[in-house]
Interface confidence: medium
Amino acid sequence: AGVFELQIHSFGPGPGPGAPRSPCSARGPCRLFFRVCLKPGLSEEAAESPCALGAALSARGPVYTEQPEAPAPDLPLPNGLLQVPFRDAWPGTFSLIIETWREELGDQIGGPAWSLLARVTRRRRLAAGGPWARDIQRAGAWELRFSYRARCELLAVGTACTRLCRPRSAPSRCGPGLRPCAPLEDECEAPPVCRAGCSLEHGFCEQPGECRCLEGWTGPLCTVPASTSSCLGLRGPSSATTGCLVPGPGPCDGNPCANGGSCSETPGSFECTCPRGFYGLRCEVSGVTCADGPCFNGGLCVGGADPDSAYICHCPPGFQGSNCEKRVDRCSLQPCRNGGLCLDLGHALRCRCRAGFAGPRCEHNLDDCAGRACANGGTCVEGGGAHRCSCALGFGGRDCRERADPCAARPCAHGGRCYAHFSGLVCACAPGYMGSRCEFPVHPDGVSALPAAPPGLRPGDPQRYL
């Protein structure tokens, strides 16, 4: 189960001559809305075939009235996402049909009328759970810019939303052979069976039969420390004599990133970091403004101050890059203390603590106070691997066993005299002062400058500090 989401960024006349000035006919005002249809597979299906994966309709946009003399403005669009829920597995390959309709608001014989302005069809491969994919499509004289993604919902995970996780409320609920689902630590799933012999300590797998190595380990079964591997950093076909990889062409060789983009290698591919004003797999799309919605992951778009930077994306916490397209590895800062495992859930960081530690950053040692009592009514405060006692009044020391003199700090102001008492201290105030610490001056007429003395106490009486 999951949801396919489509975000329309803009719809308007395409570049070039002959582009229409207005989506409305001569009959009067209109408003736009969109319909999305999803069909499984990449085959050329009959247009009439049903939207087997689902369909959705957007809300209607604001009313648009053409101003004959004015330049064609951006067309007002409906707000929000189009969401198409799917119940079964996400097929990975699908046909996406986006229709732009206009609702004609002039007098219509037979009631309100809809007219189709544009229909674009894309046959795509898309894994669920991936980032937003962006697209620009032309249909006749119109141009449509949009983003889309598929995400799993409920307890489904994986690129097809077919792997189910069972919620749990305590670690013990993950039974034998179950492990926490990444990245959600509060769910369990059956792990895939890795390649035979794959190191349990240094290897892992996301698909059955594979063996992927943790950082610092290499080899087909992740048993070779990377520091001792003579093949580290090499790529290409394996050499029969040494068992090492012979250098081959890397995905960034020849820099596939256009317009000054910088290339970085990813497993089996590459990634371009684009300068401002460009985006796309190879930074090939240019002329972008805030109207195009170039900021991903909820980034705020602000128009640039100079022509070279048409826009600037202000990224939300956890994202970076000129288009907020890169997730910050916040775990690299090692925020989890006492050996806790860091999980970046996107919306938040979470630490999975080792046994005996707790707290948002595993900062509390649960054993600090175990079996250690604080005497004389003191309370134990754990932290940093050692316990500390917060002592009751009149007591001090590591375990609150030492009698403390509450008058040692000279708490009585204005020459008041301090007396130790079973529940703390008492100040006997000098003439002209009152209060539990003799802090309030008394006016000559017997009225205090600040709160009045409680009933039954005259100014100058000893004040018991409760």
């Epitope: 249809c37 009439e48 939207c51 369909a55 809300a59 229709e99 309100p112 189709l116």
Partner: nanobody, 129 residues
Framework: QVHLMESGGGSVQAGGSLRLSCAAS????????MGWFRQAPGKEREGIAT????????YYADSVKGRFTISQDNAKNTVYLQMNSLKPEDTAMYYC??????????????????????WGQGTQVTVSS
């Protein structure tokens, strides 16, 4: 198998009210329109109100605007038609229908039958003066 079932019809005096219900089963209800149509003896079937459940877009025929209200309960896959200030000319068989723009259409009228592929059996409403 798609099934639409109307209920709530009956006889009422002019100026009175009725509430019709249409329950949909076996239908991907959220992706299309559900509408109410009526047909008086010897007349064409006419659309009076329609709603798109996903975005609550509604349309009404001029003859019922301000008197009839279409609403939905997504959880129950049910659409309602609240009819107030009924007139004798509202007497007809009332049908519930489901559908939307045909796949290859380039023009569609939400209050006309074409595009509505699924129909209920109808419920009779009689308004006497």
């Amino acid at each position: 198998q798609v099934h639409l079932m109307e209920s709530g019809g009956g006889s009422v005096q002019a100026g009175g009210s009725l509430r019709l219900s249409c329950a949909a089963s076996g239908y991907t209800y959220r992706s299309n329109f559900m509408g109410w149509f009526r047909q008086a003896p010897g007349k064409e079937r006419e659309g009076i109100a329609t709603i798109h459940s996903g975005v609550a877009t509604t349309y009404y025929a001029d003859s019922v605007k301000g008197r009839f209200t279409i609403s939905q309960d997504n959880a129950k896959n049910t659409v309602y038609l609240q009819m107030n200030s009924l007139k004798p000319e509202d007497t007809a068989m009332y049908y519930c229908a489901a559908g939307g723009p045909p796949a290859n259409a380039d023009r569609w009228y939400p209050l006309r039958p074409p595009g509505y592929n699924y129909w209920g059996q109808g419920t009779q409403v009689t308004v006497s003066s």
